[in-house]
């Protein structure tokens, strides 16, 4: 069978793809349709976030749309198809043996997805093998109601996982960001993402990445030496999408990892990150759950200083102000801290070298019954020029073997009221977190504290 898709998309004929891929299909580019669609496009980008329960912000501080609200809205918008890529699914409390009222939003989302299927809207899910949620029944429940589900064997194919988290709705709307399909992502974990509405060009481009997962989810799938042309991207760092987002001139493109899942024209995720860092002249602010200039999932670990070097070079060579805000929770690997201290040690204000590192600690409070939660899970970066919103933690595996995506957006300042560009909105969210009492300098994060809130 083929993933149902909006009717305006062409179907690839079996002769266009290797025989082993005939179970799947990929979008064909139809210039006339695309042109018609572009005229109807009125792209809009909304930043979305989850703030864990009982994590109050200072009054009047900036905020983004709540993620749970945005997801439910997207599903209300759906008319034909919803395609979801997610590392794992765990939308109900019983999935993880937890009885907690904060799981209700996830359970409502699962209900909404079932209702969607009842309305004859197609749901296609690409998820990872290996996965974290081996006891979850979400996907069985959805499959029983007609959802199409494929496990992508990234462990076998690339020795990684499918770590992407994105939706494509009706080939027109997009969610992408740090949040997995997990109830904790809505109420117990700090997340950051973006929803793009009415933007079929970008949606269809991201759909091509979904299709790379889809064809790899058939039995005995192998990685192609070269991806067929219909998987190629027209938008990349050299040729981004140009459009008006709410009337604001905007360039945007999606990047992907690992390289083996980057068909022609697709910018590699690492290259996108480095390009955004490299173009910064004033500041680089990054908020990531993990920062390791090493591999994470291979024995023994290898040193991998690519991102570390880029931050150091920006700070030391160009006087760019670097701020790194790293997640810190009960399940944070403490071997990360020496690398953070090493980066911070480069800072030398007298020589105009500014590198600051903090950890963001979400107080556990009375939520200790919820495992793998209460952490800043965001993966974004902002400079004065661009916003980068990703799905990857910052260590080698996420760029070399693990499937992820990134979104790079640049908006023209001056064409709209001050503070309205995406990069300015993201900077404000970063600075809110950076200046909050939950952001702790490394000096205040003594070894052995295990990321426990000392507030």
């Amino acid at each position: 069978w083929q993933v149902p898709r909006p009717p305006t998309w062409g179907q690839v004929q079996p002769k266009d793809v290797p025989r082993s891929w005939e179970h799947g299909s990929s979008p064909a580019w139809e210039p006339l349709e695309a042109e018609a669609r572009q005229q109807r496009d009125s792209c809009q980008l909304v930043l979305v976030e989850s703030i864990p329960q009982d994590l109050p912000s200072a009054a009047g501080s900036p905020s983004a749309q709540p993620l749970g609200q945005a997801w439910l809205q997207l599903l209300d918008t759906a008319q034909e198809s919803v395609h979801v890529a997610s590392y794992y699914w765990s939308l109900t409390g019983p999935d993880i043996g937890v009885n907690d009222s904060s799981s209700q939003l996830g359970e409502a989302l699962l209900q909404k997805l079932q209702q969607l299927l009842g309305r004859n809207i197609s749901l296609a899910v690409a998820t990872s093998s290996p996965t974290l949620a081996r006891t979850s029944t979400d996907l069985q429940v959805l499959a029983a109601r007609g959802a199409h589900v494929r496990q992508v064997p990234m462990g076998r194919l690339t020795r990684g996982v499918l770590h992407s988290k994105f939706w494509v709705v009706d080939g027109r709307h997009i969610y992408m960001g740090s949040a997995n399909m997990d109830w904790r992502s809505l109420t117990q974990v700090k997340e950051l993402g973006a929803v793009i509405y009415n933007c079929s060009h970008l949606a269809q481009d991201l759909e091509k990445t979904f299709q790379t997962y889809w064809v790899l989810g058939v039995p005995k799938a192998v990685l192609p030496k070269t991806w067929p042309q219909n998987f190629s991207s027209h938008f990349n760092r050299f040729q981004p999408f140009h459009g008006l987002f709410d009337g604001v001139p905007t360039t945007a493109y999606f990047s992907a990892s690992p390289p083996a899942l980057c068909p022609q024209g697709r910018t590699r995720d690492l290259e996108a990150l480095l390009a955004v860092m490299g173009s910064a002249q004033e500041f680089i602010y990054a908020s990531v759950m993990e920062y390791f200039p090493t591999t994470r999932f291979s024995h023994p670990p290898r040193y991998w200083p690519v991102l570390d070097n880029a931050l150091r070079a920006a700070a030391f060579g160009k006087g760019v102000r670097v701020r790194l805000l790293v997640g810190c929770g009960l399940n944070t690997d403490p071997t990360m801290f020496p690398y953070l201290r090493s980066l911070q040690a480069l800072s030398n204000p007298a020589a105009n070298v500014s590198v600051d590192v903090k950890v963001f600690i979400v107080p556990v409070g009375n939520h200790s019954n919820i495992p793998f939660s209460r952490v800043n899970h965001s993966k974004f970066m902002v400079t004065e020029k661009a916003a980068y919103i990703g799905t990857s933690n910052w260590s080698e595996d996420y760029f070399s073997s693990t499937a992820g995506v990134g979104l790079v957006v640049t908006q023209s300042p001056g064409a709209q009221p001050a503070g309205a560009t995406v990069q300015e909105q993201l900077r404000q969210l970063f600075e809110r977190d950076w200046s909050s009492r939950y952001a702790v300098g490394l000096d205040g994060q003594a070894p052995g504290q295990d990321c426990v809130w000392q507030g």
Epitope: L132, R134, E290, G329, N331, T332
Partner: antibody, heavy 124, light 107 residues
Framework: DVQLQESGPGLVKPSQSLSLTCSVT???????YYWSWIRQFPGNRLEWM?????????NYNPSLKNRISITRDTSKNQFFLKLNSVTTEDTATYNC?????????????????WGAGTTVTVSS | DIQMTQTTSSLSASLGGSVTISCRAS??????LNWYQQKPDGTVKLLIY???RLHSGVPSRFSGSGSGTDYSLTISNLEQEDIATYFC?????????FGGGTKLEIK
Amino acid sequence: DVQLQESGPGLVKPSQSLSLTCSVTGYSISSHYYWSWIRQFPGNRLEWMGYISYDGSNNYNPSLKNRISITRDTSKNQFFLKLNSVTTEDTATYNCAREGPLYYGNPYWYFDVWGAGTTVTVSS
Amino acid sequence: DIQMTQTTSSLSASLGGSVTISCRASQDIDNYLNWYQQKPDGTVKLLIYYTSRLHSGVPSRFSGSGSGTDYSLTISNLEQEDIATYFCQQFNTLPRTFGGGTKLEIK
């Protein structure tokens, strides 16, 4: 270097309780792992009995559910096994082991450190 | 519970040769399989996790493969120190379960 060492009586009478201690050095039992008990019966068969998590929560093998309790003392970095109403069928070598690592996002779990084991005979 | 079966309880091979030990699960465990070595003195050591990934410090003579319900551990260029019993273990679901073990002897 992380080390686990089991201790406790080598002989227990039927119907009594078996109590063992696992002393952990080189790593905090409040961090990042499940701390398990695994036993090996004469003839080599291994049985996972249960764990206490870094956060103090438990999970037990359903075959032992009504008889087993795993607790801990974080100040001494020790965790304990108590098995009630033992019979001769519980004669085995008892090992403690850690399973993980339970870092965010890591899907690969394994028993990477084992104790040497302590032999317990149930006999009157 | 998932049953893990190692049909061969013991086998012998020559030094320098190679040997394959197999393990079968009662249902698909989706590659969530680990291999352990237990020396004659009772010491247990992790060799391979997630079907085929070598743990730190384990010689590359050890390799693992498999999928679905069928898995295997191969030891090539056998050395005297490989005399041990080898166990498979699934971590797909709780309770964790182990195979019955395969004892390796040198001819």
